[in-house]
Amino acid sequence: QPEQKTLSLPGTYRHVDRTTGQVLTCDKCPAGTYVSEHCTNMSLRVCSSCPAGTFTRHENGIERCHDCSQPCPWPMIERLPCAALTDRECICPPGMYQSNGTCAPHTVCPVGWGVRKKGTENEDVRCKQCARGTFSDVPSSVMKCKAHTDCLGQNLEVVKPGTKETDNVCGMRLFFSSTNPPSSGTVTFSHPEHMESHDVPSSTYEPQGMNSTDSNSTASVRTKVPSGIEEGTVPDNTSSTSGKEGTNRTLPNPPQVTHQQAPHHRHILKLLPSSMEATGEKSSTAIKAPKRGHPRQNAHKHFDINEH
Protein backbone atom coordinates (compact mmCIF):
# COMPACT_ATOMS: atom_id res chain seq x y z
CA GLN A 1 0.00 0.00 0.00
CA PRO A 2 1.38 3.47 -0.82
CA GLU A 3 2.98 4.95 2.26
CA GLN A 4 4.04 8.41 3.36
CA LYS A 5 7.84 8.34 3.07
CA THR A 6 8.76 10.38 6.13
CA LEU A 7 10.94 9.49 9.09
CA SER A 8 9.30 7.99 12.12
CA LEU A 9 10.38 7.07 15.62
CA PRO A 10 12.34 3.84 16.12
CA GLY A 11 9.93 0.95 16.44
CA THR A 12 7.20 2.82 14.60
CA TYR A 13 6.23 3.45 10.99
CA ARG A 14 4.11 6.01 9.19
CA HIS A 15 0.95 4.74 7.63
CA VAL A 16 -1.53 6.60 5.49
CA ASP A 17 -5.08 5.51 6.14
CA ARG A 18 -6.22 5.77 2.56
CA THR A 19 -9.85 5.69 3.48
CA THR A 20 -9.54 8.93 5.43
CA GLY A 21 -6.27 10.29 4.08
CA GLN A 22 -4.88 10.52 7.61
CA VAL A 23 -1.20 9.91 8.33
CA LEU A 24 -0.83 7.73 11.41
CA THR A 25 2.15 6.54 13.45
CA CYS A 26 1.81 2.82 14.14
CA ASP A 27 3.97 0.39 16.12
CA LYS A 28 6.01 -1.97 13.97
CA CYS A 29 5.46 -5.72 14.07
CA PRO A 30 8.24 -8.06 15.23
CA ALA A 31 10.52 -9.92 12.85
CA GLY A 32 8.85 -13.07 11.58
CA THR A 33 5.48 -11.31 11.39
CA TYR A 34 3.81 -8.66 9.23
CA VAL A 35 1.10 -6.04 9.64
CA SER A 36 -2.18 -7.74 8.89
CA GLU A 37 -4.14 -4.65 9.96
CA HIS A 38 -2.72 -1.15 10.25
CA CYS A 39 -3.49 0.96 13.26
CA THR A 40 -6.33 3.46 13.13
CA ASN A 41 -7.33 6.35 15.34
CA MET A 42 -9.16 3.81 17.44
CA SER A 43 -7.06 0.63 17.30
CA LEU A 44 -3.53 -0.76 17.41
CA ARG A 45 -1.99 -2.49 14.46
CA VAL A 46 -2.47 -6.26 14.23
CA CYS A 47 0.50 -8.58 13.51
CA SER A 48 0.31 -12.03 11.95
CA SER A 49 2.97 -14.70 11.53
CA CYS A 50 4.63 -15.00 8.16
CA PRO A 51 3.03 -17.88 6.25
CA ALA A 52 5.17 -20.79 5.03
CA GLY A 53 7.54 -19.77 2.27
CA THR A 54 7.80 -16.16 3.46
CA PHE A 55 9.87 -14.22 6.00
CA THR A 56 10.66 -10.85 7.57
CA ARG A 57 14.16 -10.31 8.99
CA HIS A 58 13.47 -7.17 11.00
CA GLU A 59 10.66 -5.47 12.86
CA ASN A 60 8.55 -3.94 10.17
CA GLY A 61 5.43 -2.15 9.01
CA ILE A 62 4.88 -4.11 5.83
CA GLU A 63 1.63 -5.70 4.71
CA ARG A 64 2.99 -9.03 3.54
CA CYS A 65 6.11 -11.01 4.30
CA HIS A 66 8.81 -11.32 1.67
CA ASP A 67 8.78 -14.43 -0.47
CA CYS A 68 11.72 -16.70 0.24
CA SER A 69 14.28 -17.21 -2.50
CA GLN A 70 13.80 -20.13 -4.85
CA PRO A 71 15.00 -23.55 -3.69
CA CYS A 72 18.75 -23.90 -4.09
CA PRO A 73 19.61 -24.82 -7.67
CA TRP A 74 21.85 -27.85 -8.07
CA PRO A 75 24.63 -28.14 -7.04
CA MET A 76 24.10 -25.51 -4.35
CA ILE A 77 23.09 -26.53 -0.86
CA GLU A 78 21.05 -24.73 1.81
CA ARG A 79 23.07 -22.87 4.41
CA LEU A 80 19.94 -21.35 5.95
CA PRO A 81 16.43 -22.70 5.42
CA CYS A 82 13.44 -20.58 4.49
CA ALA A 83 11.82 -19.71 7.83
CA ALA A 84 9.70 -16.91 9.29
CA LEU A 85 12.83 -14.97 10.29
CA THR A 86 15.25 -15.91 7.53
CA ASP A 87 15.38 -16.17 3.80
CA ARG A 88 16.77 -19.32 2.27
CA GLU A 89 20.52 -18.98 1.77
CA CYS A 90 22.29 -21.11 -0.77
CA ILE A 91 25.99 -21.85 -0.81
CA CYS A 92 28.27 -23.99 -2.87
CA PRO A 93 29.09 -27.40 -1.45
CA PRO A 94 32.59 -28.20 -0.17
CA GLY A 95 35.08 -28.32 -3.01
CA MET A 96 33.23 -25.71 -5.06
CA TYR A 97 32.87 -21.94 -5.10
CA GLN A 98 30.31 -19.46 -6.38
CA SER A 99 31.06 -18.05 -9.80
CA ASN A 100 28.60 -16.27 -12.09
CA GLY A 101 25.63 -17.44 -10.06
CA THR A 102 26.56 -21.09 -10.14
CA CYS A 103 29.12 -23.37 -8.50
CA ALA A 104 32.44 -24.15 -10.10
CA PRO A 105 34.88 -26.75 -8.79
CA HIS A 106 37.85 -25.39 -6.91
CA THR A 107 40.99 -25.23 -9.01
CA VAL A 108 43.14 -28.35 -8.66
CA CYS A 109 46.74 -27.38 -8.18
CA PRO A 110 48.79 -29.65 -10.43
CA VAL A 111 51.77 -31.76 -9.41
CA GLY A 112 54.61 -29.43 -8.48
CA TRP A 113 52.14 -26.84 -7.26
CA GLY A 114 50.49 -26.47 -3.87
CA VAL A 115 47.62 -24.52 -2.35
CA ARG A 116 48.66 -20.98 -1.45
CA LYS A 117 45.18 -19.98 -0.31
CA LYS A 118 42.39 -22.40 0.47
CA GLY A 119 39.18 -22.11 -1.51
CA THR A 120 35.91 -21.18 0.14
CA GLU A 121 32.33 -21.33 -1.12
CA ASN A 122 32.87 -17.86 -2.60
CA GLU A 123 36.51 -17.91 -3.63
CA ASP A 124 38.58 -20.20 -5.76
CA VAL A 125 41.77 -21.89 -4.58
CA ARG A 126 45.02 -20.00 -5.22
CA CYS A 127 47.97 -22.15 -6.25
CA LYS A 128 51.69 -21.50 -6.05
CA GLN A 129 54.61 -23.37 -7.49
CA CYS A 130 56.42 -25.40 -4.86
CA ALA A 131 59.51 -23.56 -3.66
CA ARG A 132 62.95 -25.12 -3.30
CA GLY A 133 62.87 -27.73 -0.58
CA THR A 134 59.19 -28.47 -1.02
CA PHE A 135 57.15 -30.66 -3.32
CA SER A 136 53.66 -31.72 -4.29
CA ASP A 137 53.28 -35.09 -5.92
CA VAL A 138 49.50 -35.14 -6.30
CA PRO A 139 47.08 -32.81 -8.03
CA SER A 140 45.00 -31.36 -5.22
CA SER A 141 42.73 -28.46 -4.39
CA VAL A 142 43.48 -28.66 -0.67
CA MET A 143 47.09 -29.69 -0.16
CA LYS A 144 49.99 -27.31 0.33
CA CYS A 145 53.51 -28.03 -0.83
CA LYS A 146 55.21 -30.36 1.66
CA ALA A 147 58.78 -30.12 2.82
CA HIS A 148 61.16 -32.67 1.43
CA THR A 149 61.90 -35.44 3.91
CA ASP A 150 64.96 -34.60 6.01
CA CYS A 151 67.02 -37.70 5.30
CA LEU A 152 69.98 -36.58 7.41
CA GLY A 153 67.66 -35.97 10.34
CA GLN A 154 66.72 -39.64 10.13
CA ASN A 155 70.33 -40.76 9.95
CA LEU A 156 69.79 -41.63 6.32
CA GLU A 157 71.28 -40.24 3.19
CA VAL A 158 69.61 -38.82 0.10
CA VAL A 159 69.55 -41.61 -2.43
CA LYS A 160 67.62 -39.47 -4.90
CA PRO A 161 67.14 -35.72 -4.45
CA GLY A 162 63.60 -34.48 -4.47
CA THR A 163 62.13 -32.10 -7.03
CA LYS A 164 59.06 -29.85 -7.01
CA GLU A 165 57.11 -32.97 -7.80
CA THR A 166 58.83 -35.66 -5.77
CA ASP A 167 60.15 -36.14 -2.26
CA ASN A 168 63.72 -36.97 -1.40
CA VAL A 169 64.36 -40.68 -1.47
CA CYS A 170 66.27 -41.59 1.68
CA GLY A 171 68.37 -44.71 1.96
CA MET A 172 70.90 -46.53 4.09
CA ARG A 173 73.75 -48.07 2.07
CA LEU A 174 75.02 -51.45 3.10
CA PHE A 175 78.73 -51.73 2.27
CA PHE A 176 80.19 -55.07 1.18
CA SER A 177 83.71 -56.33 0.73
CA SER A 178 85.02 -55.27 -2.65
CA THR A 179 86.31 -58.80 -3.16
CA ASN A 180 82.82 -60.23 -2.87
CA PRO A 181 80.39 -57.85 -4.47
CA PRO A 182 76.79 -58.95 -4.41
CA SER A 183 74.93 -59.50 -7.62
CA SER A 184 72.69 -56.62 -6.71
CA GLY A 185 72.99 -53.83 -4.20
CA THR A 186 70.34 -53.32 -1.55
CA VAL A 187 69.01 -49.97 -0.32
CA THR A 188 66.42 -49.68 2.40
CA PHE A 189 64.41 -46.57 2.87
CA SER A 190 61.57 -45.54 5.06
CA HIS A 191 58.76 -43.06 4.91
CA PRO A 192 56.68 -42.14 7.92
CA GLU A 193 53.58 -41.92 5.74
CA HIS A 194 51.65 -44.18 3.39
CA MET A 195 53.39 -45.24 0.26
CA GLU A 196 51.65 -44.82 -3.05
CA SER A 197 52.56 -46.01 -6.48
CA HIS A 198 52.23 -43.44 -9.23
CA ASP A 199 52.32 -43.47 -12.97
CA VAL A 200 54.79 -40.68 -13.43
CA PRO A 201 55.83 -39.34 -16.81
CA SER A 202 59.52 -39.47 -17.50
CA SER A 203 59.82 -35.79 -18.31
CA THR A 204 59.52 -33.23 -15.55
CA TYR A 205 56.10 -31.55 -15.61
CA GLU A 206 56.49 -27.80 -15.86
CA PRO A 207 53.19 -25.91 -16.20
CA GLN A 208 53.38 -23.80 -19.34
CA GLY A 209 52.89 -20.08 -19.14
CA MET A 210 53.94 -20.01 -15.49
CA ASN A 211 57.23 -18.50 -14.48
CA SER A 212 58.98 -21.17 -12.49
CA THR A 213 60.29 -18.53 -10.12
CA ASP A 214 56.85 -17.08 -9.52
CA SER A 215 55.79 -18.62 -6.26
CA ASN A 216 52.63 -16.58 -5.93
CA SER A 217 50.89 -17.35 -9.16
CA THR A 218 47.29 -18.41 -9.39
CA ALA A 219 47.16 -21.64 -11.30
CA SER A 220 44.38 -21.71 -13.79
CA VAL A 221 43.86 -25.40 -14.25
CA ARG A 222 40.43 -26.23 -12.95
CA THR A 223 39.72 -29.89 -12.65
CA LYS A 224 36.04 -30.56 -13.10
CA VAL A 225 34.80 -32.68 -10.24
CA PRO A 226 32.64 -35.51 -11.51
CA SER A 227 29.31 -35.75 -9.77
CA GLY A 228 29.31 -38.39 -7.10
CA ILE A 229 32.97 -37.97 -6.24
CA GLU A 230 33.44 -38.08 -2.51
CA GLU A 231 34.78 -35.23 -0.44
CA GLY A 232 38.39 -35.81 0.48
CA THR A 233 39.39 -37.66 -2.68
CA VAL A 234 41.47 -36.16 -5.41
CA PRO A 235 39.58 -36.34 -8.68
CA ASP A 236 41.10 -37.14 -12.01
CA ASN A 237 41.81 -34.17 -14.19
CA THR A 238 39.39 -34.06 -17.04
CA SER A 239 39.48 -30.49 -18.31
CA SER A 240 41.02 -27.12 -17.77
CA THR A 241 39.94 -23.51 -17.98
CA SER A 242 41.75 -20.29 -18.68
CA GLY A 243 43.56 -18.04 -16.22
CA LYS A 244 42.20 -15.93 -13.41
CA GLU A 245 43.04 -12.60 -11.77
CA GLY A 246 43.47 -10.90 -15.10
CA THR A 247 46.65 -12.83 -15.98
CA ASN A 248 46.15 -14.70 -19.20
CA ARG A 249 48.12 -17.64 -17.96
CA THR A 250 47.21 -21.09 -19.07
CA LEU A 251 48.29 -24.48 -17.91
CA PRO A 252 48.03 -27.75 -19.75
CA ASN A 253 46.24 -30.55 -18.00
CA PRO A 254 48.44 -31.91 -15.26
CA PRO A 255 49.55 -35.51 -15.72
CA GLN A 256 47.10 -38.23 -14.83
CA VAL A 257 47.80 -39.70 -11.43
CA THR A 258 46.64 -43.08 -10.27
CA HIS A 259 46.32 -43.39 -6.52
CA GLN A 260 46.72 -46.82 -5.02
CA GLN A 261 47.21 -46.68 -1.31
CA ALA A 262 49.70 -49.23 -0.06
CA PRO A 263 50.03 -50.55 3.47
CA HIS A 264 52.25 -48.65 5.88
CA HIS A 265 55.59 -50.47 5.89
CA ARG A 266 59.26 -50.14 5.14
CA HIS A 267 60.23 -50.74 1.57
CA ILE A 268 63.27 -52.76 0.61
CA LEU A 269 64.50 -51.97 -2.86
CA LYS A 270 66.80 -54.33 -4.69
CA LEU A 271 69.06 -52.12 -6.75
CA LEU A 272 70.82 -53.47 -9.81
CA PRO A 273 74.50 -52.57 -9.86
CA SER A 274 73.99 -50.56 -13.02
CA SER A 275 71.35 -48.39 -11.45
CA MET A 276 71.01 -46.98 -7.99
CA GLU A 277 67.67 -45.34 -8.72
CA ALA A 278 64.69 -45.87 -6.48
CA THR A 279 61.28 -45.15 -7.88
CA GLY A 280 59.26 -44.97 -4.72
CA GLU A 281 57.58 -41.64 -4.02
CA LYS A 282 56.09 -40.30 -0.85
CA SER A 283 52.66 -38.76 -0.58
CA SER A 284 50.02 -38.09 1.95
CA THR A 285 46.41 -38.88 1.20
CA ALA A 286 45.02 -37.29 4.36
CA ILE A 287 43.14 -34.55 2.55
CA LYS A 288 41.26 -32.09 4.67
CA ALA A 289 37.93 -30.68 3.55
CA PRO A 290 38.21 -27.00 2.62
CA LYS A 291 37.41 -24.48 5.33
CA ARG A 292 34.24 -22.51 4.95
CA GLY A 293 34.67 -18.81 4.60
CA HIS A 294 32.16 -16.05 4.95
CA PRO A 295 29.55 -16.56 2.25
CA ARG A 296 28.26 -13.62 0.30
CA GLN A 297 24.82 -12.64 1.47
CA ASN A 298 22.07 -14.08 -0.64
CA ALA A 299 21.44 -11.93 -3.70
CA HIS A 300 17.76 -11.99 -2.98
CA LYS A 301 17.63 -8.72 -1.03
CA HIS A 302 14.65 -6.76 0.08
CA PHE A 303 14.30 -3.14 1.03
CA ASP A 304 11.17 -1.59 2.35
CA ILE A 305 10.86 1.87 3.84
CA ASN A 306 8.75 0.40 6.61
CA GLU A 307 11.04 -2.47 7.38
CA HIS A 308 14.16 -0.60 8.43
Epitope: T6, R18, T20, G21, Q22
Partner: antibody, heavy 113, light 107 residues
Framework: QVQLQQSGPEVARPGASVKLSCKAS????????LNWVKQRTGQGLEWIGE????????YYNEKFKGKATLTADNSSSTAYLQFSSLTSEDSAVYFC??????WGQGTLVTVSV | DILMTQSPSSMSVSLGDTVSITCHAS??????IGWLQQKPGKSFKGLIY???TLEDGVPSRFTGSGSGADFSLTISSLESEDFADYYC?????????FGGGTKLEIK
Protein backbone atom coordinates in the same frame (compact mmCIF):
# COMPACT_ATOMS: atom_id res chain seq x y z
CA GLN B 1 -17.88 18.00 10.44
CA VAL B 2 -15.40 17.46 7.60
CA GLN B 3 -16.13 19.65 4.58
CA LEU B 4 -14.32 20.19 1.30
CA GLN B 5 -15.51 23.30 -0.51
CA GLN B 6 -14.43 23.61 -4.12
CA SER B 7 -14.24 26.71 -6.31
CA GLY B 8 -16.83 27.50 -8.99
CA PRO B 9 -16.95 26.43 -12.66
CA GLU B 10 -14.27 27.54 -15.07
CA VAL B 11 -14.36 28.24 -18.78
CA ALA B 12 -10.98 28.48 -20.47
CA ARG B 13 -9.45 28.71 -23.92
CA PRO B 14 -7.25 25.93 -25.32
CA GLY B 15 -3.63 26.46 -24.29
CA ALA B 16 -4.59 28.43 -21.20
CA SER B 17 -4.27 27.33 -17.55
CA VAL B 18 -6.76 27.06 -14.72
CA LYS B 19 -6.24 26.84 -10.98
CA LEU B 20 -8.93 25.10 -8.95
CA SER B 21 -9.18 25.36 -5.17
CA CYS B 22 -10.44 23.09 -2.41
CA LYS B 23 -10.91 24.63 1.04
CA ALA B 24 -10.90 22.14 3.90
CA SER B 25 -12.62 22.55 7.26
CA UNK B 26 -13.59 20.42 10.24
CA UNK B 27 -10.20 18.73 10.66
CA UNK B 28 -6.46 19.46 10.93
CA UNK B 29 -5.50 20.24 7.34
CA UNK B 30 -1.83 19.22 7.68
CA UNK B 31 -2.60 15.74 9.02
CA UNK B 32 -4.36 14.34 5.96
CA UNK B 33 -3.65 13.66 2.31
CA LEU B 34 -5.85 15.32 -0.30
CA ASN B 35 -6.47 13.69 -3.68
CA TRP B 36 -7.76 15.05 -6.96
CA VAL B 37 -9.95 13.01 -9.32
CA LYS B 38 -11.11 13.74 -12.86
CA GLN B 39 -14.53 12.68 -14.16
CA ARG B 40 -15.32 12.99 -17.84
CA THR B 41 -18.73 12.08 -19.17
CA GLY B 42 -18.54 8.60 -20.64
CA GLN B 43 -14.88 8.29 -19.68
CA GLY B 44 -15.10 7.18 -16.07
CA LEU B 45 -12.94 8.36 -13.18
CA GLU B 46 -9.21 9.05 -13.17
CA TRP B 47 -7.01 9.70 -10.17
CA ILE B 48 -4.73 12.70 -10.81
CA GLY B 49 -2.55 12.71 -7.73
CA GLU B 50 -2.30 13.55 -4.06
CA UNK B 51 -0.65 16.06 -1.75
CA UNK B 52 0.23 15.89 1.92
CA UNK B 53 0.06 19.47 3.23
CA UNK B 54 2.13 18.47 6.28
CA UNK B 55 5.30 18.45 4.16
CA UNK B 56 4.04 19.20 0.63
CA UNK B 57 4.83 15.64 -0.45
CA UNK B 58 3.10 15.02 -3.78
CA TYR B 59 2.51 11.95 -5.87
CA TYR B 60 1.18 12.10 -9.40
CA ASN B 61 -0.41 9.68 -11.80
CA GLU B 62 2.16 9.40 -14.62
CA LYS B 63 -0.56 10.37 -17.05
CA PHE B 64 -0.93 13.79 -15.45
CA LYS B 65 2.74 14.63 -14.84
CA GLY B 66 3.54 17.92 -16.55
CA LYS B 67 -0.15 18.66 -16.94
CA ALA B 68 -1.26 18.97 -13.31
CA THR B 69 0.43 20.72 -10.40
CA LEU B 70 -0.74 20.19 -6.81
CA THR B 71 -0.03 22.75 -4.10
CA ALA B 72 -1.37 23.59 -0.66
CA ASP B 73 -1.61 26.71 1.48
CA ASN B 74 -1.64 25.66 5.12
CA SER B 75 -2.54 29.13 6.39
CA SER B 76 -5.89 29.00 4.59
CA SER B 77 -6.29 25.19 4.69
CA THR B 78 -6.68 25.21 0.93
CA ALA B 79 -5.38 22.78 -1.68
CA TYR B 80 -4.95 23.76 -5.32
CA LEU B 81 -4.94 21.95 -8.64
CA GLN B 82 -3.43 23.82 -11.58
CA PHE B 83 -4.01 22.47 -15.08
CA SER B 84 -1.83 23.86 -17.87
CA SER B 85 -1.89 23.83 -21.68
CA LEU B 86 -5.57 23.05 -21.70
CA THR B 87 -7.18 21.06 -24.50
CA SER B 88 -10.71 19.82 -25.03
CA GLU B 89 -9.63 16.55 -23.35
CA ASP B 90 -9.32 18.50 -20.10
CA SER B 91 -13.00 19.42 -20.09
CA ALA B 92 -14.32 17.52 -17.06
CA VAL B 93 -15.50 17.75 -13.48
CA TYR B 94 -12.63 17.76 -10.98
CA PHE B 95 -13.10 16.55 -7.42
CA CYS B 96 -10.91 16.95 -4.39
CA UNK B 97 -11.18 14.08 -1.91
CA UNK B 98 -9.81 13.29 1.52
CA UNK B 99 -9.11 9.59 1.33
CA UNK B 100 -11.81 7.72 -0.54
CA UNK B 101 -14.63 8.67 1.81
CA UNK B 102 -14.89 12.47 1.91
CA TRP B 103 -15.44 14.29 -1.37
CA GLY B 104 -15.81 17.89 -2.44
CA GLN B 105 -18.77 18.88 -4.62
CA GLY B 106 -16.64 19.09 -7.78
CA THR B 107 -15.64 21.86 -10.18
CA LEU B 108 -16.68 21.81 -13.82
CA VAL B 109 -13.98 22.93 -16.25
CA THR B 110 -14.98 23.65 -19.84
CA VAL B 111 -12.32 24.21 -22.49
CA SER B 112 -13.72 25.86 -25.61
CA VAL B 113 -12.58 28.18 -28.35
CA ASP C 1 -1.86 0.04 -13.39
CA ILE C 2 -4.44 -2.13 -11.69
CA LEU C 3 -7.51 -2.55 -13.88
CA MET C 4 -10.82 -2.63 -12.05
CA THR C 5 -13.51 -4.41 -14.04
CA GLN C 6 -16.98 -3.61 -12.73
CA SER C 7 -20.17 -5.36 -13.72
CA PRO C 8 -22.87 -4.99 -14.70
CA SER C 9 -22.59 -1.55 -16.26
CA SER C 10 -26.30 -1.01 -15.63
CA MET C 11 -29.26 -2.87 -14.19
CA SER C 12 -32.99 -2.26 -13.87
CA VAL C 13 -34.44 -3.40 -10.57
CA SER C 14 -37.53 -2.94 -8.47
CA LEU C 15 -37.97 -1.45 -5.02
CA GLY C 16 -37.37 -4.06 -2.33
CA ASP C 17 -35.09 -6.17 -4.53
CA THR C 18 -31.61 -7.26 -3.54
CA VAL C 19 -28.81 -6.50 -5.99
CA SER C 20 -25.11 -7.29 -6.21
CA ILE C 21 -22.47 -5.34 -8.09
CA THR C 22 -19.08 -6.95 -8.60
CA CYS C 23 -15.58 -5.61 -9.12
CA HIS C 24 -12.61 -7.69 -10.27
CA ALA C 25 -9.06 -6.37 -9.81
CA SER C 26 -6.42 -7.36 -12.38
CA UNK C 27 -4.16 -8.31 -9.47
CA UNK C 28 -4.59 -8.98 -5.77
CA UNK C 29 -5.32 -5.86 -3.71
CA UNK C 30 -5.94 -7.53 -0.33
CA UNK C 31 -8.92 -5.55 1.02
CA UNK C 32 -7.91 -2.11 -0.25
CA ILE C 33 -11.16 -1.31 -2.02
CA GLY C 34 -13.91 1.19 -1.44
CA TRP C 35 -17.43 1.60 -2.84
CA LEU C 36 -18.84 5.00 -3.81
CA GLN C 37 -22.31 6.25 -4.63
CA GLN C 38 -22.98 9.17 -6.99
CA LYS C 39 -26.36 10.62 -7.63
CA PRO C 40 -27.02 12.44 -10.93
CA GLY C 41 -25.38 15.88 -11.00
CA LYS C 42 -24.01 15.39 -7.50
CA SER C 43 -20.74 14.47 -5.86
CA PHE C 44 -19.65 11.13 -4.40
CA LYS C 45 -20.50 9.57 -1.09
CA GLY C 46 -18.26 6.90 0.43
CA LEU C 47 -20.26 3.82 1.42
CA ILE C 48 -17.76 1.10 2.23
CA TYR C 49 -14.00 0.97 2.75
CA UNK C 50 -11.53 -1.86 3.38
CA UNK C 51 -13.88 -4.05 1.33
CA UNK C 52 -16.33 -4.68 4.17
CA THR C 53 -16.37 -1.72 6.61
CA LEU C 54 -19.49 0.44 6.49
CA GLU C 55 -18.90 4.19 6.64
CA ASP C 56 -20.64 6.05 9.47
CA GLY C 57 -24.22 6.98 8.62
CA VAL C 58 -24.55 4.46 5.78
CA PRO C 59 -27.59 2.15 6.12
CA SER C 60 -26.88 -1.47 7.04
CA ARG C 61 -28.63 -2.72 3.91
CA PHE C 62 -25.30 -1.96 2.13
CA THR C 63 -22.75 -4.73 2.60
CA GLY C 64 -19.36 -5.29 1.05
CA SER C 65 -17.58 -8.59 0.66
CA GLY C 66 -14.56 -10.16 -0.99
CA SER C 67 -10.80 -10.15 -0.65
CA GLY C 68 -7.84 -10.46 -2.97
CA ALA C 69 -9.16 -9.71 -6.45
CA ASP C 70 -12.92 -10.28 -6.41
CA PHE C 71 -15.29 -8.01 -4.53
CA SER C 72 -18.96 -7.24 -4.41
CA LEU C 73 -21.35 -4.64 -3.08
CA THR C 74 -24.77 -5.95 -2.12
CA ILE C 75 -27.79 -3.74 -1.51
CA SER C 76 -30.73 -5.53 0.06
CA SER C 77 -34.31 -4.26 0.15
CA LEU C 78 -33.69 -1.46 -2.34
CA GLU C 79 -35.19 1.93 -1.48
CA SER C 80 -35.88 4.79 -3.86
CA GLU C 81 -32.84 6.80 -2.66
CA ASP C 82 -30.55 3.91 -3.67
CA PHE C 83 -31.09 4.44 -7.38
CA ALA C 84 -27.77 5.99 -8.43
CA ASP C 85 -24.39 5.23 -9.94
CA TYR C 86 -21.97 3.03 -7.98
CA TYR C 87 -18.21 2.82 -8.37
CA CYS C 88 -15.48 0.71 -6.84
CA UNK C 89 -12.02 2.18 -6.23
CA UNK C 90 -8.78 0.41 -5.36
CA UNK C 91 -6.25 2.18 -3.16
CA UNK C 92 -3.70 -0.63 -2.82
CA UNK C 93 -1.33 0.76 -5.39
CA UNK C 94 -0.61 4.02 -7.20
CA UNK C 95 -2.25 5.17 -9.31
CA UNK C 96 -5.59 4.58 -7.63
CA UNK C 97 -8.02 3.22 -10.18
CA PHE C 98 -11.79 3.05 -10.44
CA GLY C 99 -14.29 0.62 -11.86
CA GLY C 100 -16.32 1.75 -14.86
CA GLY C 101 -19.46 2.24 -12.75
CA THR C 102 -22.87 0.60 -12.45
CA LYS C 103 -26.05 2.52 -13.13
CA LEU C 104 -28.91 1.32 -10.95
CA GLU C 105 -32.30 2.20 -12.52
CA ILE C 106 -35.86 1.64 -11.40
CA LYS C 107 -37.64 -1.01 -13.44
Amino acid sequence: QVQLQQSGPEVARPGASVKLSCKASGYTFTDYYLNWVKQRTGQGLEWIGEIYPGNNHTYYNEKFKGKATLTADNSSSTAYLQFSSLTSEDSAVYFCTRGVIKWGQGTLVTVSV
Amino acid sequence: DILMTQSPSSMSVSLGDTVSITCHASQGIRNSIGWLQQKPGKSFKGLIYHATTLEDGVPSRFTGSGSGADFSLTISSLESEDFADYYCVQYAQFPYTFGGGTKLEIK
